[in-house]
Structures are given as structure tokens and as C-alpha cells.
């Protein structure tokens, strides 16, 4: 399974000062799924990590990049059936003998326990309980992401009050 | 126009093995996602699994999973559908959908679907 | 699994009426639904995606709405080749589910 979709669209202005104040909407694309600052795509076919990868470009996105421990719960949340892999975005680097992320970053060690090998043509994916490494050119699903996107509210200020 | 034409109807006993075909025309083949549905007499659609037909992977309906092998000839741009150990209850009418989107779930070309007919 | 179950089975109508077919979901499954029309001896023809969304070079009479778990096909002033199989998906989940189908029939 995957999560539901299609509940996209948020109003996250938390401080309202003023009444008058138009609120600006962060929205995500249709089809997009919201979650906090992001906006995800699960894929619904399977592709090798580098296709995965190359797919989610073509939606003006990237696999999906995980900050810390608190979002990977939130995206593992997301995900109802433990039969179910995920690619993100990070492999191994072989030059730098380290976990490197799609945006050039490197793994830090408190953020992801990865099980399986850090080793040339190993990429990482998640399933609902955890974070495995696999060679790259296993096929499996894949989760794109874009940030949130700035959508100025055309409705008039009294409508919201 | 994008075509999926599947072969013809069989016949098999208990027990036994049926490949599906499912040629593609009128499009890249390599750029669509096909999957498997079936229909069986009286019943609603159910859906049995999918093939990148780029790539050749799978991802199979954990009901079929077991019995179900899905396959794709890049060269002649046809994907096939072999069901083994065959049971009456798989008498169905079978179809190939294609993918309308790597990221949706809706099915926007379908083969005429082929009648296998499991009988002793 | 989520089931989907559509109402009326079966229905009879006439040229020109508009209909309405229902099709309730288990559990919320957001828009993530698909409507087909299906003729005998016939392969489906989707209508509708994304619970609302006609697919490209189908008529303005069809029309699709819901969100969660309640959805509706309608079809606004019913033409002869309209009288057909119609059936509700969704792919909220990676197993994907149908309804089990809406006869329309003339009248």
C-alpha cells in the first residue's frame, strides 16, 4: 500500500499579526502529496536507483533527501505496507568511501542507521521500519520531492477572517 | 493510435501453465508501465501485477506473487503474462492495461483482453 | 484491502436523462479514483482520473466529484452509446482495487 494522496494544498502562515494581512499559500502540485516543508510524489512503477533518479528530475524534483531522523519517521509514517522499498537520494560514494547525498552532502552518522553494505553500487532505500542499502540496479519504487512553493492568496483579506 | 493487441483465447486443465501476449504499437513501449488485470465471469477487475517494460522489472500483486511471471520482448515490443498452476477459479478474461503515468495508478490503454478457460 | 462498492448495479434510463453513479470507498482514499466505461466484448475506456479529471477526448456530459470516500460519475444527458458497464478504481494503495461495476441499460 501507500498513502492516501490527494490532499495537497496548506495554509501555513502561523503568524498572522494582523487581520488585514493577506496569508500567503504554500501549495504543492496536483497529485503532490504535503508533508511539513515538502511536497512528495510516490512513484506507482519500479525503475534501478539511476532511473528513479532520472525520472524524478523530469518532474522538476529530486529523490527524496531525508534531514534527520524526525522526517524519516514522518515519511515511514507515510508508508502502510512493510512489503513495500523506497529509493531516496543517497548512495555510496566509492571516491570518498561515504554515504553522499543526491545535493552533494555526506552523511552524517547520527542521522541514518543504514543496514546492509557501504560499498561501490550501493544505494539506500526505505521501507516502513528501515533503512537498507542495495545494489543500485535492484528495481523498486521511488519517492520524488520539491519544496513547497509560494502561491500568493488572491482571496480578499475578509474572507478569512 | 496507441494499440494493445493480446492473443487469442485457451483452454487449459487444472494444473497447467498460460503465457499471455500483449503487443504495443503506436507508441514507445519502453515508456509505459504495463500491468495485468483480470476479469472473471460475473466478477469485478483485479488487478495482478505490473513489468517496466524498460527495464524489466516487476511488482506482482501479493496474491498472484507466487504463480504469476510477467515478461517483455523489448525487440518486438510485446509483454507477456504467464499464470502457472492453474485452478478453475482463474477462468477469467485477461487484459494488459498500460500506465497512463509513473506516478498515478489509472490505466489509459487496454488490450481486447484474452479468455483462458481452465476446465478438466 | 480497500473495497470499493458502487450503487446501483444496475439502471435503467433513458436518452437525455442524466444519471448518477456512487462509488464508496473502505477508507479515505483522497481523489485517487478512476472511472471506466466498459461495452461488451470490449476492452474499458477511461473517463476519468484523479476522481475528477476527464481523460483526453471524452465527452463534456461525463463529469466526476468525491473526495475520501464517497464518489460520484455523472452523466449529464445520457446519448445512446453512453449505455454501458461502468466501474470506479482506486490507487490510493499499491493494490490497486475496482468496484464491482454499474449496468446502465435503456429504459
Known amino acids: 500500500q501507500k498513502p492516501s494522496i490527494g490532499k495537497c494544498s496548506v495554509d501555513i502562515q502561523q503568524n498572522r499579526t494582523k487581520t488585514t494581512e493577506r496569508p500567503d499559500l504554500l501549495n504543492c502540485p496536483i497529485y503532490w502529496q504535503q508533508v511539513q516543508e515538502k511536497c512528495l510524489l510516490f512513484s506507482h512503477t519500479v525503475n534501478p536507483w539511476n532511473n528513479s533518479l532520472a525520472d524524478c528530475s523530469t518532474k522538476e524534483s529530486s529523490l527524496l533527501l531525508i534531514q534527520d531522523k524526525d522526517e524519516l519517521t514522518r515519511t515511514q509514517n507515510l508508508i502502510h505496507d512493510k512489503a513495500i522499498s523506497f529509493w531516496i537520494g543517497l548512495n555510496f560514494s566509492l571516491s570518498e568511501k561515504n554515504w553522499k547525498w543526491i545535493n552533494g552532502s555526506f552523511l552524517s552518522s547520527n542521522d541514518l542507521k543504514i543496514t546492509g553494505d557501504a560499498k561501490e553500487n550501493s544505494c539506500v532505500y526505505i521501507s516502513q521500519t528501515s533503512v537498507y542499502s542495495e545494489y543500485c540496479s535492484t528495481e523498486m519504487k521511488w519517492i520524488c520531492q520539491k519544496e513547497l512553493t509560494l502561491v500568493r492568496n488572491k482571496v480578499s483579506p475578509d474572507s478569512w477572517l | 493510435q496507441v494499440q494493445l493487441v493480446q492473443s487469442g483465447a485457451e483452454v487449459k486443465k487444472p494444473g497447467a501453465s498460460v503465457k499471455v501476449s500483449c503487443k504495443a504499437s503506436?507508441?514507445?513501449?519502453?515508456?509505459?508501465?504495463m500491468n495485468w488485470v483480470r476479469q472473471a465471469p460475473g466478477q469485478g477487475l483485479e488487478w495482478m501485477g505490473l513489468i517496466n517494460p524498460n527495464t524489466g522489472g516487476t511488482y506482482y500483486n501479493q496474491k498472484f506473487k507466487d504463480r504469476v511471471t510477467m515478461t517483455r520482448d523489448t525487440s518486438i515490443s510485446t509483454a507477456y503474462m504467464e499464470l502457472s498452476r492453474l485452478r478453475s477459479d482463474d477462468t477469467a478474461v485477461y487484459y494488459c492495461a498500460r500506465l497512463g503515468d509513473n506516478y498515478r495508478g489509472y490505466f489509459d490503454s487496454w488490450g481486447q483482453g484474452t479468455t483462458v478457460t481452465v476446465s478438466s | 484491502d480497500i473495497q470499493l462498492t458502487q450503487s446501483p448495479s444496475f439502471l435503467s434510463a433513458s436518452v437525455g436523462d442524466r444519471v448518477t453513479i456512487t462509488c464508496k470507498a473502505s477508507?479515505?482514499?483522497?481523489?485517487?479514483v478512476v472511472w471506466y466505461q466498459q461495452k461488451p466484448g470490449k476492452a474499458p475506456k477511461l473517463l476519468i482520473d484523479?476522481?475528477?479529471i476527464r481523460h483526453t477526448g471524452v465527452p463534456s456530459r461525463f463529469s466526476g466529484s468525491g473526495s475520501g470516500t464517497e464518489f460520484t460519475l455523472t452523466i449529464s444527458s445520457l446519448q445512446p452509446e453512453d449505455f454501458a458497464d461502468y466501474f470506479c478504481q482506486q490507487y490510493s494503495t499499491y493494490l490497486y482495487t475496482f468496484g464491482g461495476g454499474t449496468k446502465l441499460e435503456i429504459k
Open positions: 484523479w476522481a475528477s
Open positions: 503506436g507508441y514507445s513501449f519502453t515508456g509505459y508501465t
Open positions: 477508507q479515505d482514499v483522497g481523489t485517487a
